[in-house]
Interface confidence: low
């Protein structure tokens, strides 16, 4: 399927609107510090060039690869060296190294100001004045803050963003209509970004075999009626889509994702009975719907797995003939029978099964050796079951904020070298697992909880890789993708850690504390809690609770005072002294 002009091919396949949107996302994800206007100019130039190639595929430069065209365009940015430093060195390289170089300089934690939401009337005026620019600005701002955001999905978010403004800017109460929709988009967007980041980390750090294994397990749970060959085909196609998006090939990725959606909708009968309502929707919505589709019902008469994978005398023969296919079939068969298991647990079981066959197929009596392999799965299954049970009980007992605090203390004691903002962000997100998963029925709790935790812990791994400070974190993050969560769960108090010297400045608060939103107040208090644990890692729960209760009381008292600043100045040092005494 070769084309004289790749850029013309993608422009024609995607259409001008999606083409421009995807190029803007690609550029914004690579050059995260560039001003909006600069990116719009580059996108317009690329689009005009693409149109000349559509008109005449033999025109000059139309035969160049997309990486060459986009890279050349990015390297025309005048301030590259001043703004990005050594990233400018990428421009001295040839493709494909230049693109690899740009990819390596993507920043998961760019130094960008948090997005401030203007007044509703201001936003509606901007939307009506220039809708196209308003929506481009949205793509740009999200893409530069989330350099691995799944680009075709970001187009779907932008479409929903547009729909929200179109509807709510005409409503009687604009704010009541718009703000909940924007909050929902923000929260869903952050979750989508984090999920995609795990997919890219899986591909980039552990290879496509790891991603394919994840996809086999997940798709087998979703489509338990589909044949193994059908699941394998979907896995191959899905791997291609995500490899492209994670590699910055956003036009190819969006095009291939559309092809995959088309294929799934044309072959619903052999995939799942749940696809019908997705397939009636327009493209962006259809692809999103297919990705989020609920699990189909399990076939009623699935035989026991033991016959083919334990009792059969041909296990070692089948394994030796085609290891990956045999293990893939095992994973498929196990996953379609267990929608109640997390994907990560299923992958651990497949890994344990593989290890047993590696050992036993070389033994004198292989069958005798692997006869009890399913018994070995029991502790692997019980570990996440118990973890979910204990943490949901704790969540129900404490509520979200205090549950987050318990996790903050737990994780700061495990890895106190990690920066305080990272510990706060990650622990707050770990704590959200309670509200997200604990209300679900038993059969859905573990897949919800453990697979969500994998996404959150990947964020810790990604941030830590940028600035490595803890060997324990590096070990848990790099040794095994499927065992990351158990690895972190197993970490104990770091005995080698030298407690941080007490710094009164860290615990000095001002009247501006009183004007913060509830969420911002929580973050301030949780930041103080992490610093306390770093100062006194062996402090008991009771000691820390006492200090935090005093802190809350001190803040509440000063925020009610007439002269708030004076109160903070006077009461602050007393609180610090009392806290030090309590923790001595």
């Amino acid at each position: 399927d070769t084309h004289k002009s790749e850029v013309a091919h993608r422009f024609k396949d995607l259409g001008e609107e999606h083409f421009k949107g995807l190029v803007l996302v690609a550029f914004s994800q690579y050059l995260q510090q560039c001003p909006f206007e600069e990116h719009v100019k580059l996108v317009n130039e690329v689009t005009e060039f693409a149109k000349t190639c559509v008109a005449d595929e033999s025109a000059e430069n139309c035969d160049k690869s997309l990486h060459t065209l986009f890279g050349d365009k990015l390297c025309t940015v005048a301030t590259l060296r001043e703004t990005y430093g050594e990233m400018a060195d990428c421009c001295a390289k040839q493709e494909p190294e230049r693109n690899e170089c740009f990819l390596q300089h993507k920043d998961d934690n760019p130094n960008l100001p948090p997005l401030v939401r203007p007044e509703v009337d201001v936003m509606c005026t901007a939307f009506h004045d220039n809708e196209a620019t308003f929506l481009k600005k949205y793509l740009y701002e999200v893409a530069r803050r989330h350099p691995y955001f799944y680009a075709p999905e970001l187009l779907f978010f932008a479409a929903r963003y547009k729909a929200a403004f179109a509807e709510c800017c005409q409503a009687a109460d604009k704010a009541a209509c718009l703000l909940p929709k924007l909050d929902e988009l923000r929260d869903e967007g952050k979750a989508s970004s984090a999920k995609q980041r795990l997919k890219c980390a899986s591909l980039q750090k552990f290879g496509d075999r790891a991603f394919k294994a994840w996809a086999v397990a997940r798709l087998s749970q979703k489509f338990p009626k589909a044949e193994f060959a059908e699941v394998s085909k979907l896995v191959t196609d899905l791997t291609k889509v995500h490899t492209e998006c994670c590699h910055g090939d956003l036009l190819e990725c969006a095009d291939d994702r559309a092809d995959l959606a088309k294929y799934m909708c044309e072959n619903q009968d052999s995939i799942s009975s749940k696809l019908k309502e997705c397939c009636d929707k327009p493209l962006l919505e259809k692809s999103h719907c297919l990705a989020e589709v609920e699990n189909d019902e399990m076939p009623a008469d699935l035989p026991s797995l033991a016959a083919d994978y334990v009792e059969s005398k041909d296990v070692c023969k089948n394994y030796a003939e085609a290891k990956d296919v045999f293990l893939g079939m095992f994973l498929y068969e196990y996953a379609r029978r267990h929608p109640d298991y997390s994907v990560m647990l299923l992958l651990r079981l497949a890994k344990a099964y593989e290890a047993t066959l590696e050992k036993c197929c070389a033994a004198a009596d292989p069958h005798e050796c692997y006869a009890k392999v399913f018994d070995e799965f029991q502790p692997l299954v019980e570990e996440p079951q118990n973890l979910v049970k204990q943490n949901c009980e704790l969540f129900e007992q404490l509520g979200e904020y205090k549950f987050q605090n318990a996790l903050l203390v737990r994780y700061t004691k495990k890895v106190p070298q990690v920066s305080t903002p990272t510990l706060v962000e990650v622990s707050r997100n770990l704590g959200k697992v309670g509200a997200k998963c604990c209300k679900l029925p038993e059969a859905k709790r573990m897949p919800c909880a453990e697979d969500y935790l994998s996404v959150v812990l990947n964020r810790l791994c990604v941030l830590h890789e940028k600035t490595p400070v803890s060997e324990k974190v590096t070990k848990c993050c790099t040794e095994s993708l499927v065992n990351r969560r158990p690895c972190f769960s197993a970490l104990e108090l770091d005995e080698a850690y030298v407690p941080k010297a007490f710094n009164a400045e860290t615990f000095t608060f001002h009247a501006d504390m009183c004007t913060l939103s509830e969420k911002e107040k929580q973050v301030k208090k949780q930041t103080a809690l992490v610093e306390l644990v770093k100062h006194k890692p062996k402090a008991t729960k009771e000691q820390l609770k006492g200090v935090m209760d005093n802190f809350a009381a001190f803040v509440e008292k000063c925020c009610k005072a007439d002269d708030k600043e004076a109160c903070f100045a006077e009461e602050g040092p007393k609180f610090v002294a009392a806290s030090q005494a309590a923790l001595a």
């Epitope: 980039q204 750090k205 552990f206 290879g207 075999r209 790891a210 990956d324 040794e479 095994s480």
Partner: nanobody
């Protein structure tokens, strides 16, 4: 403990060939994409070639395309780089790395191309 040990470097005349090996241990080699990276004296590390976990997908820097071949033997946990038609500008310390990283976590093997 992750360990990568390169071997096979040496002094060779322009136009000559060498085969580098990288023996891996301490991790599931067959699950990872691997790369070769080189560093010439006084220069930064330069990515040379990459191969996916199964060995099907290989990528090369323009400067070595058509001359170098990357391969792997997952059973032996070994990565290879066959270098033909070597040029003086290929002179560098060669390192194998996990994934597409250009950060060096090993000792490397010296390749010198000179007449």
């Amino acid at each position: 403990e992750v360990q990568l040990v390169e071997s096979g470097g040496g002094l060779v005349q322009p136009g000559g060939s060498l085969r580098l090996s990288c023996a891996a241990s301490g991790f599931t080699f067959g699950s990872f994409g691997m790369s070769w990276v080189r560093q010439a004296p006084g220069k930064g590390p330069e990515w040379v070639s990459a191969i996916d976990s199964g060995g099907a997908d290989t990528r090369y820097a323009e400067s070595v395309k058509g001359r170098f071949t990357i391969s792997r033997d997952n059973a032996k946990k070994t990565l290879y780089l066959q270098m033909n038609n070597l040029k003086p500008e290929d002179t560098a310390m060669y390192y194998c790395t996990i994934g597409r990283s250009t950060s060096r976590g090993s000792q490397g093997t010296q390749v010198t191309v000179s007449s």
